[in-house]
């Protein structure tokens, strides 16, 4: 079965800067990736970025740079200040829509013990089926 992994990293240089990396472990063709924070997309989460393999990338603050790393993984840099700034226990979710598998989503956050500059290992953490 397909899996989605999520890795969250706080940058040592800027404590309000986070990098989220997500990947899809499956054989299908990815048609869309949606990154949200504060919970899963469509379930109270706020959309930060949408990445389509051919149609382009859209992002909204505090997202600063979303990009494809490979054909099955993406990264997103967040920078915030004040109300729009992510904090250490913020949950980030990545939802991959793929054919023929359907939609798969996983969420992750910084581990409580993380030092700046360290990251959580990529986790296929709670995988939610959302066909």
């Amino acid at each position: 079965t397909p899996e989605v992994w999520v890795q969250v990293r706080m940058e040592a240089t800027e404590l309000s800067s986070f990098t989220i990396r997500c990947g899809f472990l499956g054989s299908g063709s990815i048609s869309l990736v949606t990154v949200s924070w504060g919970g899963p997309n469509g379930a109270g989460g706020t959309t930060l970025a949408v990445l389509h393999p051919e149609r382009g990338i859209r992002q909204w603050a505090p997202a600063r740079q979303a990009r494809w790393e490979t054909q099955s993984s993406i990264s997103l840099i967040l920078e915030g200040s004040g109300a729009s700034s992510p904090c250490a226990n913020t949950t980030f979710c990545c939802k991959f829509a793929s054919f023929p598998e359907g939609s798969w989503e996983a969420c992750g956050s910084l581990p409580p013990s993380s030092d700046p500059g360290l990251s959580a290992p990529p986790t296929p953490a709670p995988i939610l089926r959302a066909d």
Epitope: R55, G56, I57, I74
Partner: antibody
Framework: QVQLQQPGAELVKAGASVKMSCKAS????????ITWVKQRPGQGLEWIGD????????NYNEKFKNKATLTVDTSSSTAYMQLSSLTSEDSAVYYC???????WGQGTTLTVSS | DIVMTQSPSSLSVSAGEKVTMSCKSS????????????LAWYQQKPGQPPKLLIY???TRESGVPDRFTGSGSGTDFTLTISSVQAEDLAVYYC?????????FGAGTKLELR
């Protein structure tokens, strides 16, 4: 079917503001972003900005940052664009479009009178 | 901002002719991570909103006739109409879908000779 409904025309005096609407139907409003595009008579297309319902941080073309304000009302599935301190340069057709530009409104023709 | 330059600004054609128009971007529209070009082409007829024809530089939008073909990579792109029909007379715009702001070219107007 997917529809983006825009008022056909707005006539506003120079120096005033206008708030134009784009009412979406036929799809889940909170699942797609709305982009606004300007077209002056006989001219090309200018990208103004986009907004995702539920995210209060629109993207703006720097050129329109002090001119346009994008908002949404999820309860009525309507996107709004307010244009301030209007001049004759703002007279144009303004389109709203969904997501990756697959559906467009018919456009609102803004005429700024002196 | 990425500047999109289209040429020619207008083209006079006869029905059945093959036509090509060019679009050049001031920066590469190639996404290195997945090797996709983020460029779109639109068709606009008088009094109508633009219609998406091509995305990803070469993928036809659903319902677009196969006489429309997009090609190119990096900074140089082309839209080809293999056999122009009367209903194809319109203005064609290319758009940078790579980075904000999503700038458009000035357009190529297709006219009947």
């Amino acid at each position: 079917q997917v529809q983006l409904q825009q008022p056909g025309a707005e006539l506003v005096k120079a120096g005033a503001s206008v708030k134009m609407s784009c009412k979406a139907s036929g799809y889940t409003f909170t699942s797609y972003w709305i982009t606004w595009v300007k077209q002056r008579p006989g001219q090309g297309l200018e990208w103004i900005g986009d907004i995702y319902p539920g995210n209060d941080s629109p993207n703006y073309n720097e050129k329109f940052k002090n001119k346009a304000t994008l908002t949404v009302d999820t309860s009525s599935s309507t996107a709004y664009m307010q244009l301030s301190s209007l001049t004759s340069e703002d007279s144009a057709v303004y389109y709203c479009t969904r997501g990756y530009y697959d559906y467009w409104g018919q456009g609102t023709t803004l005429t700024v009178s002196s | 901002d990425i500047v999109m330059t289209q040429s020619p600004s207008s083209l006079s054609v006869s029905a059945g002719e093959k036509v090509t128009m060019s679009c050049k971007s001031s920066q590469s529209l190639l996404n290195s991570g997945n090797q996709k070009n983020y460029l779109a082409w639109y068709q606009q007829k008088p009094g109508q909103p633009p219609k998406l024809l091509i995305y990803g530089a070469s993928t036809r939008e659903s319902g677009v006739p196969d006489r429309f073909t997009g090609s190119g990579s990096g900074t140089d792109f082309t839209l080809t109409i293999s056999s122009v029909q009367a209903e194809d007379l319109a203005v064609y715009y290319c758009q940078n879908d790579h980075s904000y702001p999503h700038t458009f070219g000035a357009g190529t107007k297709l006219e009947l000779r």
